[in-house]
Amino acid sequence: MAKAAAIGIDLGTTYSCVGVFQHGKVEIIANDQGNRTTPSYVAFTDTERLIGDAAKNQVALNPQNTVFDAKRLIGRKFGDPVVQSDMKHWPFQVINDGDKPKVQVSYKGETKAFYPEEISSMVLTKMKEIAEAYLGYPVTNAVITVPAYFNDSQRQATKDAGVIAGLNVLRIINEPTAAAIAYGLDRTGKGERNVLIFDLGGGTFDVSILTIDDGIFEVKATAGDTHLGGEDFDNRLVNHFVEEFKRKHKKDISQNKRAVRRLRTACERAKRTLSSSTQASLEIDSLFEGIDFYTSITRARFEELCSDLFRSTLEPVEKALRDAKLDKAQIHDLVLVGGSTRIPKVQKLLQDFFNGRDLNKSINPDEAVAYGAAVQAAILMGDKSENVQDLLLLDVAPLSLGLETAGGVMTALIKRNSTIPTKQTQIFTTYSDNQPGVLIQVYEGERAMTKDNNLLGRFELSGIPPAPRGVPQIEVTFDIDANGILNVTATDKSTGKANKITITNDKGRLSKEEIERMVQEAEKYKAEDEVQRERVSAKNALESYAFNMKSAVEDEGLKGKISEADKKKVLDKCQEVISWLDANTLAEKDEFEHKRKELEQVCNPIISGLYQGAGGPGPGGFGAQGPKGGSGSGPTIEEVD
């Protein structure tokens, strides 16, 4: 079997999607329900744990124990205002465990509490299993996507979720970057193009501006709102219908979790309908206290309900343009990503903002991120397909990186949206006379004061010779590599003394020795994989040739053109080879090639004799090759599972 494929997972707030790059193209993989996206839902019942469609389908019956939106919790503290705000909307309980949020549910009759990483890992496990069912072998390597605005701790927590799911997370990449890759593969245009990616999904909103030039992607700017998406539009509909129910039936259903959940499901369905129809109806039997709720909503009313939300999507567009130092006229392509970009009003607002520019909707908006992640996974696994081998991904630092200077000021060395890898150096000095050392505190964030930003790590540079304040020269270098690993070095220029810190996003890192051993093993496996790939390629070439030759001489059109003796000679040899193949699927490359050459030695002279004067190819599209005319092995299969 060829090298196992790596998968790309779009771990969405509301829905997740998995893809794999094989045979030169991306396959978005359907789950066991035939759906190409899977709800990011986990349900706990008295008897079992459900993930995906099965979990979402029973949410109305079991709202307290059906967990969704784990992505809104992951990598956040319990006291985070976002967590506190979101908790109000969730039917499941979130508890505080050392300022870490945990979801508390009843499972098999017991109270259990799970970290967001654990819930996300369950969704990732489901996506892994979906891929394995399709591919037919175990999958371990994956690229997982996150919103552009995820900070270090959110990215690390997502990576941890992958590890818990038994995945080797090759890389965490930004969702818009993944979408850009997907889009780039569909483009064959020449020259540099500025592309604006507008990603409005179920839970996050990201705007990215990228430059795509001959397969090279560079993220110029990102902006967005980590808390805007389809669910917010659902909430507007839910609130609208709660009010309507009050008016019609004089009853408030808002405190009945099951009723609200059932209403929300119907609202989501209506919202989807309104993208293609101007009206949608809701029919919910016995919604509350035995009352059936039959109603409808027009597209115009829906647009009115969400008008401020829809309009707010343009603010990050303007911000991204400013950050990229581009005018809207300089954007060549507008790309829609995320299911919510199907909403006609959203499309119209964007189109109008760009003075009627056509929107690129060629990529299925629900699948574009997973598509790109799958391509990136293939790149990281060393896929040699011509579709991907020239692709270079220049990602960006999602947040500014800097250090604390006097007075708790955040001094950024690497600005947000800087293309990575990057390296920046700046000279700092002492604050006090005869200061013997400096404390280097590394932060990420956009706020002016470090207290409002995220501390990544700290280290001390000591042994500075006594000197008046402002005299010592401390050279600080921030160096971030393609994997987002940050090295911060501080050097006292007078003594050459230096100290450094590596911020890797990896708690519990492997030792140098283990990494070295794994690198060596990886090299060994890479060589083994190549041998295996060549072996399978040789096997397939032999198999193709044998079956093609067999069908060629059995072709009715050859009656009278080929002697029975020659026909028998070819068929006997083909039979020998085909049977040998069946019995020797694990033979070596040399053996397959030897058999193919043997078969060619028998078949080529006979087949070419038939077409010598015909001036056309032989049966099955084979050219009549003269001596030394090539291997004659027919069409080879370039990629094999």
Epitope: D572, Q575, E576, I578, S579, W580, D582, A583, N584, A587, D590, E591, H594, K595, K597, E598, E600, Q601, N604, P605, Q625, P627, K628, G629, G630, S631, G632
Partner: antibody, heavy 116, light 112 residues
Framework: QIQLVQSGAEVKKPGASVKVSCKAS????????MNWVRQAPGQGLEWMGW????????TYADDFKGRFTFTTDTSTSTAYMELRSLRSDDTAVYFC?????????WGQGTLVTVSS | EIVLTQSPDSLAVSLGERATINCKSS????????????LAWYQQKAGQSPKLLIY???TRESGVPDRFSGSGSGTDFTLTIDSLQAEDVAVYYC????????FGGGTKVEIK
């Protein structure tokens, strides 16, 4: 009648090269593969590999990869075996043999002696 | 790689007597599709080129006397010379063509 006629004996110094020819007659050269077999003095037969005379693609046995090259010239119905960087243990008789269901016709053999 | 082991290394048989040479393969040489075993026998007289005697275990090459016969299947094969003649003094080699080609080490047949 079918015949395979090989070139004459060669005496070479270590490090030199030798090219043995095998001229076929009496049949269509490109319809049958040509094998090469080595026999060191007092030893058994060793299969070196073969060449597909129709496509010119060679196959080498594991022990004969690297210094050995099989070629053909279809215009003269001749197969060649070249051996580079000769060593003393390359001293042997080299046979060419046509292959149908087996090696049905053999050349008379060419003795290559490697000596300093 | 398939290894062929011949036994005995040498054998002395009286004129007119039967000579039996064995060849054991490290893996089966049987092809279920063609129902054939891909084993051949060659004779090499002193100072001469080898000569094909038998292929596909038991099919005699044209012109080969019928005192030469081959048998066996799978991994165990036998060449039998029914009534040894003086001109049969030679070294006999088995060769497999099931996958790539390999010769056995040879069996020297002499007159007793």
């Amino acid at each position: 009648q079918i015949q395979l006629v090989q070139s004459g004996a060669e005496v070479k110094k270590p490090g030199a090269s030798v090219k043995v020819s095998c001229k076929a007659s009496g049949y269509t050269f490109t319809n049958y593969g040509m094998n090469w077999v080595r026999q060191a003095p007092g030893q058994g037969l060793e299969w070196m590999g073969w060449i597909n005379t129709y496509t010119g693609e060679p196959t080498y046995a594991d022990d004969f990869k690297g210094r050995f090259t099989f070629t053909t010239d279809t215009s003269t119905s001749t197969a060649y075996m070249e051996l580079r960087s000769l060593r003393s243990d390359d001293t042997a008789v080299y046979f060419c043999a046509r292959y149908d269901h087996a090696m049905d016709y053999w050349g008379q053999g060419t003795l290559v002696t490697v000596s300093s | 790689e398939i290894v062929l082991t011949q036994s005995p290394d040498s054998l002395a048989v009286s004129l007119g007597e039967r000579a039996t040479i064995n060849c054991k393969s490290s893996q089966s040489l049987f092809n279920s599709g063609t129902r054939k075993n891909y084993l051949a026998w060659y004779q090499q007289k002193a100072g001469q080129s080898p000569k094909l005697l038998i292929y596909w275990t038991s099919t005699r090459e044209s012109g080969v006397p019928d005192r030469f016969s081959g048998s066996g299947s799978g991994t165990d094969f036998t060449l039998t010379i029914d009534s040894l003649q003086a001109e049969d003094v030679a070294v006999y080699y088995c060769k497999q063509s099931y996958t790539l080609y390999t010769f056995g080490g040879g069996t020297k047949v002499e007159i007793k």
